[in-house]
């Protein structure tokens, strides 16, 4: 049905590759391994995706259903303020932080948490159903 279609956004096509979970108009990958923040980002890029950028509270709430107490890296960093990897500011949720050295963002079922970027954690990647479509 979707072959040959050229969508300008991530809409309409139902399929995600193996190992990816479809929710809404995107595909999500929840890692089985643990890496530091930078290596998690590189993993996602090497699979033609991005470390998870959450667009709104609705997406965050729905993703948290799939999470446990364990934290997962997401595409959120503190560079003079918390920003997503697409450059947008974090403006729909609070993030807990215990120290100024915790400059990378993670998520679990309870919310967002700052962490030292060197800690190995699980991670979440996000992409469009087709690799030739830009996520942002």
């Amino acid at each position: 049905l979707c072959q040959g279609s050229n969508y300008s956004t991530c809409a309409s096509c139902p399929s995600c590759p193996d190992r990816w979970m479809k929710y809404g108009n995107h595909c999500y990958y929840f890692s089985v391994e643990e890496k530091d923040w930078n290596s998690s980002l590189e993993f996602c890029l090497a699979r033609d995706s991005h470390l998870l950028v959450i667009t709104d509270n609705q997406e965050m709430s729905l993703l948290q259903v799939f999470l446990s107490e364990a934290f997962c890296w997401i595409g959120l960093r503190n560079n003079s303020g918390w920003r997503w990897e697409d450059g947008s500011p974090l403006n729909f949720s609070r993030i807990s932080s215990n120290s100024f050295v915790q400059t990378c963002g993670a998520i679990n079922k309870n919310g967002l948490q700052a962490s030292s970027c060197e800690v190995p954690l699980h991670w979440v990647c996000k992409k469009c159903p087709f690799a030739d479509q830009a996520l942002f």
Epitope: P17, D18, R19, S31, V32, E33, E34, K35, D36, N38, S39, E42, F43, L45, A46, R47, D48, E118, V119, P120, A131, D132
Partner: antibody
Framework: EVQLVESGGGLVKPGGSLKLSCTAS????????MSWVRQTPEKRLEWVAT????????NYPDNVKGRLTISRDNAKNNLYLQMSLLKSEDTAMYYC????????????WGQGTSVTVSS | GIQMTQSPSSLSASLGERVSLTCRAS??????LNWLQQKPDGTIKRLIY???SLDSGVPKRFSGSRSGTDYSLTISSLESEDFVDYFC?????????FGGGTKLEIK
């Protein structure tokens, strides 16, 4: 059976160039990120490049950035490593490796192709 | 990058003997460690991934374990084909880094 077969190695002068190739079979090549790893004459192993499934993203350690370029042709199941401005310290056996999809580094290795940089 | 210190660099042992090789990471890498085997012809094969999971086809005499930032590969009863080179590889943090290798020799 997963197979990775490298070619293109040889003797090259310092400052010279060389292009290595790797032909993959036994798996769906376009679904895997791929890497090159080298082994020095002293047997030290060193990761030198990774490329994404589609070829849109590359990653290199700092010591080879700008001199080594990884690329791929998914239609031909081929992986490449273009090497330029070669130095004696680039002398090594170069291995084509498949990246474990789940992120557990390299799961299959080729037999290697030897590169010697010497005047 | 993370330094992986592998020991011993060489080890002499007898057929049937139990041996352990160790890699120490310079910082926390969780369970993100592989063990590789290299034959004399240069062929490299992954034996163990994620610290303790055996790759398919790898004999059960091989096992992996972890204590803090120390990682061990144990061969419970050495066979003739085990007398080759072994390397560890961490993949928690880019750049991926390898141990210096252990050459296992027959006594």
């Amino acid at each position: 059976e997963v197979q990775l077969v490298e070619s293109g190695g040889g003797l090259v002068k310092p400052g010279g160039s060389l292009k290595l190739s790797c032909t993959a079979s036994g798996f769906t090549f376009r679904n895997y990120a791929m890497s090159w790893v080298r082994q020095t004459p002293e047997k030290r192993l060193e990761w030198v490049a990774t490329i994404s499934e589609s070829g849109n993203y590359n990653n290199y350690p700092d010591n080879v950035k700008g001199r080594l370029t990884i690329s791929r042709d998914n239609a031909k199941n081929n992986l490449y490593l273009q090497m330029s401005l070669l130095k004696s310290e680039d002398t090594a056996m170069y291995y084509c490796v498949r990246d474990d999809w789940e992120g557990r580094a390299m799961d299959y290795w080729g037999q290697g192709t030897s590169v010697t940089v010497s005047s | 990058g993370i330094q992986m210190t592998q020991s011993p660099s060489s080890l002499s042992a007898s057929l049937g003997e139990r041996v352990s090789l160790t890699c120490r990471a310079s910082r926390d890498i969780g369970s993100s460690l592989n063990w590789l085997q290299q034959k004399p012809d240069g062929t490299i094969k992954r034996l163990i991934y994620a610290t303790s999971s055996l790759d398919s086809g790898v004999p059960k005499r091989f096992s992996g374990s972890r204590s803090g930032t120390d990682y061990s590969l144990t061969i419970s009863s050495l066979e003739s084909e085990d007398f080759v080179d072994y390397f560890c590889l961490q993949y928690a943090s880019s750049p991926w880094t390898f141990g210096g290798g252990t050459k296992l020799e027959i006594k």
